[in-house]
Amino acid sequence: HTAAQDNCTCPTNKMTVCSPDGPGGRCQCRALGSGMAVDCSTLTSKCLLLKARMSAPKNARTLVRPSEHALVDNDGLYDPDCDPEGRFKARQCNQTSVCWCVNSVGVRRTDKGDLSLRCDELVRTHHILIDLRHRPTAGAFNHSDLDAELRRLFRERYRLHPKFVAAVHYEQPTIQIELRQNTSQKAAGDVDIGDAAYYFERDIKGESLFQGRGGLDLRVRGEPLQVERTLIYYLDEIPPKFSMKRLTA
């Protein structure tokens, strides 16, 4: 896998251990926690990143109305089970044999159950709404400039194809970025919108996953764009299945 050959590091994932033990002495990097080989020329899957995070020392830690089926990650961190490709397994369980089904971004989409719970397939999250609030500025940002800057960022930093950034909405101080990617649209080699959104979320929190790159310095025509709040909504190709008790809570 491609990595910086001179000093054998993984530019796209600092939560790796790298050594020149690949074919022909090439640099090969493995994710912490899982030990899985990662491709350092692209983003690492969210599942492997969460697993690595859980294995690390604990101190390492026009606006759209989201649909009624939109999920927010309220459960926080957990140590996920990943498949051989690094994707989330459809069923996740904890050490006390409590199980639940997740979507392709690892967010719970059913009530919690026991080991008898069945999750037939990994349901794809095809629409992600990133809701940001920026710190006060002298005036509003120019919408077109802000829109272009965020689209450029997702192309350049996260390698997300421009066709997957569906829209950027802005009503000062709220910015919404819509990412859309159906199963049929995603070609081999395309970055997954869930992975791009996760890297962006960590960048915004000042917890960049990139190795040897500065933190995210977002500017619109030279004016700093500082985010003070982030909310991410996930929409699945099949609506989630929660009991009425949760829905009325």
């Epitope: 077109s144 272009a148 192309r155 421009p162 950027v168």
Partner: antibody
Framework: EVQLVQSGPEVKKPGASVKVSCKAS????????IGWVRQAPGQGLEWIGE????????YYAEKFKGRVTMTADTSTSTAYMELSSLRSEDTAVYYC??????????WGQGTLVTVSS | DIQLTQSPSSLSASVGDRVTITCSAS?????MYWYQQKPGKAPKLLIY???TLASGVPSRFSGSGSGTDFTLTISSLQPEDFATYYC?????????FGQGTKLEIK
Amino acid sequence: EVQLVQSGPEVKKPGASVKVSCKASGFTFTDYVIGWVRQAPGQGLEWIGEIYLGSGTIYYAEKFKGRVTMTADTSTSTAYMELSSLRSEDTAVYYCARGSIFPFDYWGQGTLVTVSS
Amino acid sequence: DIQLTQSPSSLSASVGDRVTITCSASSSVSYMYWYQQKPGKAPKLLIYDTSTLASGVPSRFSGSGSGTDFTLTISSLQPEDFATYYCQQWSSYPYTFGQGTKLEIK
């Protein structure tokens, strides 16, 4: 096969406007970005701006803001770049180039714009 | 704006020579891109993401570097390599190019 075919050479008087076209084929037009770059005779490359073909989002380099207009006609898969208030320093070859997860992966053949009185 | 300065501006070399062109950025960039341009032709993408060869580019070309200092190397010059080379960044708007390095036959 990805192709970007640009319009022919133009001779314009100072103060006039020029509109250069870039017809795309071989890919889904609205999935990409078209950037515009110019090159004065014997000089280097200078970025003018870009247009996201799916959304119509545009970003112009500060130097050209107010003088340049980028548009696209999705029905004919053609992008346009219009530069107004032309002066002799605008004499250059103007290139369109496709953008994806790369800034420019395919380029048009270039359009020579000559500004002369 | 991020300024890119290429060195040298021009270079005379012979077929078979090893050639190195450097590109220095005024502030840190994530990746560098390199283009080859021949007279009367459009630029052609040569190297992306600092060190990855674009499709169809011979293995005698290589790229390296990080932060503010980047290098394009041609290990053994071939007659078709005599051209002008440009580095380019897109870590921030506006995208900028180096002033170019003209590679001529000695």
